[in-house]
């Protein structure tokens, strides 16, 4: 169909309760383009009509509420007047049990579920809260350890909880609840967040660490687009360079002629301590010599690689 | 002893800018929240902007949304406020406060005071 | 936002007579009060915060009491240097917000 397929990473959601995600990837978003999404490489678009359970809402795909059936890989297709990019995601669906100190913690959870407060300063935890405009968020109210919070050293702005003179007692299973208000309908939202107490500034000390990949291999098609993302949390007056090498060499010195290969525009997000930094690898077009290579993530002294594979045949297929 | 010190204060007109700075001394600066508070001539107090140790949390008033900016330099014990597309209901005595408990205010500089007049 | 009302605007005393001073929010703001004095020609000084608690050095004779929406700023007898500008503060909601405050004048 002539749409380039990009994969983007895992998302761990919630059941039972309303998921957005945002069909956003610069600059293919940013000019004049038509956005439409499909569940598991189904032909027929998710629904537009608002009063369903899962449907399109702009560039988004929104989920009023999630259920344990949603998990699977949702694509949206970005057409341009001359291009048109097939984005995969793969959206995975867990039962939330906040509450219950039985289950143990949940693996891979984002910085968004795992925040840090520090000893003795004037801190604040997040509630990352996105959905699209359609969507109307009422006040945010904070627990912790399944109570509600009260108290003279806690106050709400906005989406944070602003915690005066941190102590050691303050870690543990934050929770913040919002009730969000679609077409009428009200939906609860409810996001956990594994609070750590550090005493110094710094994320790690000076060592920035990568987050992702993690010296791994990625399955890849033959002639596919694949772009794959660094990320890098460091200290916010960091120096360390961000970059993706190969042999030893610059992806964009490397593919200097062909261009196949290139390095994107670094982004970061701020955080209470420390910066996430994203930067990614593009591949046009996977070709056989990519394969077994590793394509290094480099921060500062720390590294860490992906090396590209064929996927496994199908045997179905025959 | 704790102290701050407002600087940057001057006569501007309408529609120009105008960036203020605080030296912060005696006290741990890189642990507390930072705010700007002003006092028009004669009038009571009006908080206008607040910023987190890190940078990380930063609001304001309504009255300067989209038109002022905090920031601060922790290096430097620094606090900053910069003020664009002035207005004159901007004139004020414009104080530098610690936060104490976020978002009471226990130390206080003496104040840079902002004219903005055509 | 949150208004904070204060009264009286005016408080005329003498010296050793005690000073009542009230400040009304339009909603309740819990135990997230505090109160200021201003001297002339000086910044303000942070005197009570969360309602009754003394900050650094503020003498005994100034306490604060109340809760919700209504609260009191008391100065159990006044000295000379008392006589000045007070302001309450509110930081239960964003923005924070000032009464417009009282002057105690001596009479």
């Known amino acids: 169909d002539g749409c380039k397929d990009i994969f983007m990473k895992n998302e761990i959601l919630s059941a039972s309760q309303p998921f957005a995600f945002n069909c956003t990837f610069p600059p293919i978003t940013s000019g004049e383009v038509s956005v439409t999404w499909y569940k598991n490489s189904s032909k027929i678009p998710v629904s537009k009509i608002i009063q369903s359970r899962i449907h399109q809402d702009e560039t988004w795909i929104l989920f009023l509420p999630m259920e344990w059936g949603d998990s699977g890989v949702y694509q949206c297709v970005i057409k341009g007047r001359d291009s048109c990019h097939r984005i995969h995601v793969n959206l995975t669906v867990f039962e939330k049990h906040w509450c219950d100190t039985s289950i143990g913690g949940l693996p891979n959870l984002s910085d968004e579920y795992k925040q840090i407060l520090h000893l003795g300063k004037d801190d604040s935890l997040t509630c990352h809260l996105h959905f699209p405009k359609s969507c109307v968020l009422g006040p945010i109210k904070w627990y912790k350890d399944c109570n509600e919070i009260k108290g003279e050293r806690f106050t709400v702005l906005e989406t944070r909880l602003l915690v005066s003179n941190v102590s050691a007692e303050d870690r543990g299973n934050y929770a913040c609840q919002a009730i969000l208000t679609h077409s009428g309908k009200q939906y609860e939202v409810l996001n956990g967040i594994t609070v750590s107490i550090t005493e110094r500034a710094g994320y790690g000390g000076s060592v920035p660490k990568i987050i992702y990949p993690k010296n791994h291999s990625i399955e890849v098609q033959l002639g596919t687009t694949l772009i794959v993302d660094c990320n890098v949390t460091d200290t916010k007056d960091n120096t360390n360079l961000r970059c993706w090498r190969v042999n030893n060499t610059l992806v964009d010195d490397y593919y200097d002629e062909s261009k196949r290969i290139r390095e994107g525009v670094e982004t970061h997000v701020s955080f209470r301590e420390h910066n996430l930094y994203t930067v990614n690898i593009t591949f046009l077009e996977v070709k056989m010599e990519d394969y077994g290579l590793p394509f290094m993530c480099h921060a500062g002294v720390s590294t860490a690689y992906i090396i590209l594979q064929l996927p496994a045949p199908d045997f179905r297929a025959y | 002893e704790v102290q701050l010190v407002e600087s940057g204060g001057d006569l501007v007109q309408p529609g120009r800018s105008l960036r203020l700075s605080c030296a912060a001394s005696?006290?741990?600066?890189?642990?507390?929240?930072m705010h700007w508070v002003r006092q028009a001539p004669g009038k009571g107090l009006e908080w206008v902007s607040v910023i987190s140790w890190n940078s990380d949390v930063i609001a304001y008033s309504d009255s300067v949304k989209g038109r002022f900016t905090i920031s601060r330099d922790n290096a430097k014990n620094s606090l900053y406020l910069q003020m664009n597309s002035l207005r004159t209901e901007d004139t004020a005595l414009y104080y530098c406060?610690?936060?104490?408990?976020?978002?009471?205010?226990?130390?206080w500089g003496q104040g840079t005071l902002v004219t903005v007049s055509s | 936002e949150i208004v904070l009302t204060q009264s009286p605007a005016t408080l005329s005393l003498s010296p050793g007579e005690r000073a009542t001073l009230s400040c009304r929010a339009s909603?309740?703001?819990?135990?997230?009060l505090a109160w200021y004095q201003q001297k002339p020609g000086q910044a303000p000084r942070l005197l009570i915060f969360n309602v009754a608690n003394r900050a650094t050095d503020i003498p005994a004779r100034f306490s604060g009491s109340g809760s919700g929406t209504d609260f009191t700023l008391t100065i159990s007898s006044l000295e000379p240097e008392d006589f000045a500008v007070y302001y309450c503060?509110?930081?239960?909601?964003?923005?924070?917000?000032f009464g417009g405050g009282t002057k105690v004048e001596i009479k």
């Open positions: 503060q509110q930081r239960s909601n964003w923005p924070l917000t």
């Open positions: 406060t610690k936060g104490h408990k976020w978002s009471f205010f226990d130390y």
């Open positions: 909603q309740s703001i819990s135990s997230y």
């Open positions: 005696g006290f741990t600066f890189d642990d507390y929240a």
